[in-house]
Interface confidence: medium
């Protein structure tokens, strides 16, 4: 099978993140997650969903911070 | 009542095109996957591809090679199937299926379907 | 690829029973497998989840064992509404090729005598 990107939305980064969801991600979608490299112009968070997407995320954002916060502990 | 409702089924020539709907009612549309998944008659299931509503990424089995396209309207809650060049071996039942994730490794599962809509290919 | 292979094609069993339908997968899959029922005229209706977890409104009567290649669905106390044709299903994602697929089993029909 193939997976697409879509214009709605930052999928399938490379290395760095340029643009960032505008959508919070459901948590249950959600596998694992990396940061970007900080020589990045701008940083971000990827999130890897169960169906193996990457989405670029602002890390200023709670919502974020809170995902990572229970991913850590969990 | 979660429900899901599929229209568009008909007869088409070969090569024709065609546009199924999926009308989904009772649940939060965005929430999961939508898949759709096709029956020849008398034959067994075979999964086409699904959407991530949220985002509108799609994924599509091998075989589909383009011919097909998923692509959703969150604000009307209703899934779509756009049929291209298709021949008499497209001859099925097309079901729109929730695709649920599993709590805690990759992909899921369908735990509601439409009732499906026939779709027949002859000249 | 992944390919699910699922065995007897058909089964018959008398009421009061017990059927034992296997599905293979053709390469480890840990746990996630689901099972449907599917009877004519109708769509299939999820009867288990993650190989043994039963779905909502299911019966006891229905068992999900296994994991990484080999599941067994069990049916005990066979009803004649259990006649019925059941597929197994998985969603195989590779990290290597970042590409996901669902495959479905090739179905076992159920005969209840």
């Known amino acids: 099978t193939k997976t697409e990107s879509s214009s709605r939305g930052p999928y399938h980064p490379s290395e760095c993140c340029f643009t960032y969801t505008t959508y919070k991600i459901p948590r249950q979608r959600i596998m694992d997650y990396y940061e970007t490299n900080s020589q990045c112009s701008k940083p971000g968070i990827v999130f890897i969903t169960k169906r193996g997407h990457s989405v670029c995320t602002n890390p200023s954002d709670k919502w974020v911070q809170d995902y990572i916060k229970d991913m850590k502990e969990n | 009542q979660e429900q899901l409702k599929e229209s568009g089924g008909g007869l088409v020539q070969p090569g024709g095109s065609l546009k199924l709907s999926c009308k989904a009612s009772g649940f939060a549309f965005s929430s999961d996957y939508m898949s759709w998944v096709r029956q020849a008659p008398g034959k067994g299931l075979e999964w086409i591809g699904y959407?991530?509503?949220?985002?509108?990424?799609?994924a599509y089995a091998s075989w589909v090679n383009g011919r097909f396209t998923i692509s959703s309207h969150n604000a009307q809650n209703t899934l779509y199937l756009h049929l291209n060049s298709l021949t008499a071996a497209d001859t099925a039942t097309y079901f729109c299926a929730r695709d649920k994730d599993y709590s805690s490794g990759w992909g899921g599962y369908f735990n509601l379907w439409g009732q499906g809509t026939l779709v027949t290919v002859s000249s | 690829a992944i390919v699910m292979t699922q065995t007897p094609a058909s089964v018959e069993a008398a009421v009061g029973g017990t059927v034992t339908i296997k599905c293979q997968a053709s390469?480890?899959?840990?746990?996630?497998l689901a099972w449907y029922q599917q009877k004519p005229g109708q769509p299939p209706r999820l009867l288990i989840y993650?190989?043994?977890t039963l779905a909502s409104g299911v019966p006891s009567r229905f068992k999900g064992s296994g994991s990484g290649t080999q599941f067994t669905l069990t049916i005990s106390d066979l009803e004649c509404a259990d006649a019925a044709t059941y597929y197994c299903?998985?969603?195989?994602?590779?990290?290597?090729?970042?590409?996901?697929?669902?495959?479905f089993g090739g179905g076992t029909e159920v005969v209840v005598k």
């Open positions: 959407i991530d509503p949220i985002f509108g990424s799609t």
């Open positions: 390469q480890s899959i840990n746990s996630y």
């Open positions: 993650e190989a043994s």
């Open positions: 299903q998985t969603y195989y994602y590779s990290v290597d090729s970042s590409v996901g697929s669902n495959a």
